[in-house]
Interface confidence: low
């Protein structure tokens, strides 16, 4: 037999319940048999009513949700903050890379600058969009950059005697760029570096954003009625007996929580794999898999590719002169 | 070595950033994130224990509540009795995960698959295809991970430029203005402009 309620008038229970639910009409004046109770099954007279029980269940589930939110708060903040920081950092890297590339053109090839700035800007805009998940092909981005640059290099540096560039010769030069491998293996090299580094960067950001989604979903889990009943028994049923100061047993709490969280704990295996896979990805993010390293070094590779064109300028001018003769003649008329 | 443009910014603009004691790179920041995430590796399996430890539980009291009655904290009744005549706890576990939980698991499965396919094979940072592009062995050390270019005039060498400074302080204020490489000014530990070495005639 449990000790009799210390307060024969349910006064303590009423004052506690008032904090949960203003309006005292649900609390009996004196202990009652409580035959209608479904959760806090009484072993004797009780200070609880069916309505109180329902309120306790609701409160227990709310408590549980709040505890869950506080449990995930630090983790959630960690991922949200880092996802934002990295996204901003990657945007800054792209902006610097664009500035470095523009500077290289301005300082070394001033005659190319107005158009080069435009092509470089378009390329790095595509890079940003790709990182954020756009459906753009990296090889196409790189090809477009070199396809656009070559006509300008040819007409401004290699054959400056030509009249203002016209679509005809530009199209011919764009074609010649690929056919004659005008830039050597540099475009392929840049494709490899850029696609590898951007792919990894994109997945890294995707993984962080998915981490946020997972924690957000965990945060808003709704617990079943069965769980609500278990929590009510654990946290509130003692009040019905007037035992206001008593706390649940530790082992009992663990059993209840494991019951309530049986589904949630199943996430554990996949969550572990997520962190370990992310670690593996991060460990590999260096050299050509590090977009910072690759993008900020791009301008020097582009510079070298233009030098390569210049070194082979004599032969190229002759070959292109023949290949695009038709277009050039049409231009002169 | 990689060539850097000579003039740092239009109008010789100077970029100065308050000195940060521990210079951070993006990669160090990534590693730091992973270390912190690893401290949450048991997040889901530890949730029941976390919630019990953050809700009122009898710790120093002699008596505690087991769901039905007041019992001694170390008695067998402390864990078991409260569960009698209740709905079946085993049944609760056997119901299978909630739809929301299944949704979380599916999302994690998907990203894990992506992460696995993207993970860089250990010790193989540069693809064979790149080796065949004419990268000369020896020019870049033991492995050719450092080489990221080849042409008649030698290798292109990349250095990580961006110092990932605390709170992303390092930012250019000229967007379309050409930039250059920053050097740490050795006198005042601020990043300032300086002439790059190696300019074409």
């Amino acid at each position: 037999q449990p000790p009799p309620p210390p307060d024969a008038t349910c006064h303590q229970v009423r004052s506690f319940f008032q904090r949960l639910q203003p309006g005292l009409k649900w609390v009996p004046e004196t202990p009652v048999p409580g035959s209608d109770l479904q959760v806090c099954l009484p072993k004797g007279p009780t200070c609880c009513s069916r309505k109180m029980e329902e309120k306790y269940q609701l409160t227990a589930r709310l408590n549980m949700e709040q505890l869950l939110q506080s449990a995930s708060m630090e983790l959630k903040f960690l991922i949200i903050q880092n996802a934002a920081v990295f996204q901003e950092a990657f945007e800054i890297v792209v902006r610097h890379a664009k500035n470095y590339t523009n500077a290289m053109f301005k300082n070394n090839y001033p005659s190319l600058t107005p158009q080069a700035f435009e092509f470089v800007g378009e390329f790095f805009t595509d890079v940003s969009l790709y990182i954020l998940g756009s459906d753009i092909n990296v090889d196409d981005m790189v090809n477009e950059l070199f396809d656009s640059l070559f006509p300008v290099i040819y007409t401004q540096m290699m054959n400056p005697g030509l009249p203002e560039s016209v679509l005809d010769i530009n199209e011919c030069l764009r074609g010649a760029r690929r056919d004659l491998k005008v830039f050597g293996s540099f475009p392929k090299l840049i494709m490899t570096q850029v696609s590898k580094s951007l792919q990894v960067t994109r997945i890294f950001l995707q993984a962080l954003n998915l981490g946020i989604e997972v924690i957000n979903t965990t945060d808003h889990l709704k617990f079943s009625k069965d769980c609500g009943r278990m929590l009510t028994r654990m946290w509130y049923c003692s009040y019905c007996q007037g035992l206001m100061m008593v706390k649940p047993c530790g082992g009992y709490c663990n059993v209840v929580m494991q019951g309530c969280m049986a589904g949630v704990v199943e996430i554990d295996k996949y969550w572990r794999e997520y962190i370990l896979s992310l670690e593996e990805l991060v460990n590999g993010m260096y050299r050509i898999y590090d977009m910072e390293n690759v993008l900020l070094g791009l301008f020097s590779t582009i510079h070298d590719s233009i030098q390569y064109v210049q070194k082979n300028g004599g032969k190229l001018t002759t070959t292109i002169g023949k290949l695009c003769a038709h277009s050039q003649q049409r231009q002169y008329r | 070595s990689a060539y850097y443009p000579e003039d740092l910014f239009i109008d010789k603009k100077i970029l100065k950033v308050a000195h940060v004691e521990h210079e951070e790179t993006l990669s160090s920041r990534r590693r730091e994130l992973i270390q912190k995430l690893k401290s949450f590796i048991n997040f889901y399996s530890a949730l029941p224990g976390y919630i019990c430890s953050h809700s009122p539980v009898a710790e120093n009291d002699t008596l505690c509540w087991n769901g039905q009655e007041l019992v001694e904290r170390y008695s067998q009744k402390a864990a078991r009795n409260g569960m009698k005549n209740q709905f079946n706890l085993h049944e609760l576990k056997m119901k299978g995960p909630e739809p929301v939980v299944s949704q979380i698991i599916d999302k994690l499965k998907h990203i894990n698959q992506l992460l696995r396919t993207m993970s860089v094979p250990k010790g193989k940072v540069l693809d064979k295809s790149l080796d065949e592009e004419g990268l000369e062995s020896g020019d870049c050390g033991d492995d050719e991970d450092e080489c990221i270019g080849s042409s008649g005039d030698g290798m292109v060498k990349v250095k990580n430029q961006l110092r990932f400074l605390a709170e992303l302080a390092y930012d250019l204020d000229v967007d379309d203005a050409p930039g250059n490489k920053q050097h740490g000014n050795q006198k005042d530990n601020e990043i300032t402009t300086s002439h790059s070495v190696g300019n074409m005639p």
Epitope: Y286, R287 | Y3, D153, Q186, N189, M200
Partner: antibody, heavy 119, light 107 residues
Framework: QVQLQQSGTDLARPGASVKLSCKAS????????ISWVKQRTGQGLEWIGE????????YYNEKFTGKATLTADKSSSTAYMELRSLTSEDSAVYFC????????????WGQGTALTVSS | DIQMTQSPASLSASVGETVTITCRAS??????LTWYQQKQGKSPQLLVY???TLAEGVPSRFSGSGSGTQFSLKINSLQPEDFGTYYC?????????FGTGTKLDLK
């Protein structure tokens, strides 16, 4: 002020390995490359290779691949060079030198470590 | 690798004189050339980079010139502290190579 402090004189047996150190101070160690240069008695200078402290990536002169291994410890701002399978040809003064910035121009040098390989 | 050849191999001069040391590269290195001074038992000191830019703290009596494959270092009004060995070095890609050295001693 910038300083590169190298380890003291070293004596080693043929076939052995030796690890020389170069402790940097007065600047951000991870921002600049550290090169190693060999000078045999009464002879010119030879570039061995360079280490990028931030990534720990080495970059060797082909001639010294397999002979030298360059490493760096960010926490102590120290660069290391290990020389293996030593022969009398490796007897020399070895300098570490800091990159000026974006090219192989060396603005600060260590005092040098004299290595003698003798049986 | 690019070969760097210095001439003369040695040179004697007096304080107050003007001397010129030359350096030739086996291929075009544009302006990617550096000059160092080394005194007996000491480490080299940077004098000039980019063929003609004087390093910080280097007296103006030193001047560098040239581009492509031919370079020279001129020292006006020699001072006692100027005696030692001078090395040129290209920084046009890897590996950077040094010249054979020019020993400047007191006549």
């Amino acid at each position: 002020q910038v300083q590169l402090q190298q380890s003291g004189t070293d004596l080693a047996r043929p076939g052995a390995s030796v690890k020389l150190s170069c402790k940097a101070s007065g600047y951000t160690f991870t921002s600049f490359g550290i090169s190693w240069v060999k000078q045999r008695t009464g002879q010119g200078l030879e570039w061995i290779g360079e280490i990028y402290p931030r990534s720990g990536s080495p970059y060797y002169n082909e001639k010294f691949t397999g002979k030298a291994t360059l490493t760096a410890d960010k926490s102590s701002s120290t660069a290391y060079m290990e020389l293996r399978s030593l022969t009398s040809e490796d007897s020399a003064v070895y300098f570490c030198a800091k990159d000026f910035g974006s090219s192989y121009v060396f603005d600060y040098w260590g005092q040098g470590t004299a290595l003698t390989v003798s049986s | 690798d690019i070969q760097m050849t210095q001439s003369p191999a040695s040179l004697s001069a007096s304080v107050g004189e003007t001397v010129t040391i030359t350096c030739r590269a086996s291929e075009n290195i544009y302006s990617y050339l550096t000059w160092y001074q080394q005194k007996q038992g000491k480490s080299p000191q940077l004098l000039v980079y980019n063929a003609k830019t004087l390093a910080e703290g280097v007296p103006s009596r030193f001047s560098g010139s040239g581009s492509g494959t031919q370079f020279s270092l001129k020292i006006n009004s020699l001072q006692p502290e100027d005696f030692g060995t001078y090395y040129c070095q290209h920084h046009y890609g890897t590996p950077p190579t040094f010249g054979t050295g020019t020993k400047l001693d007191l006549k």
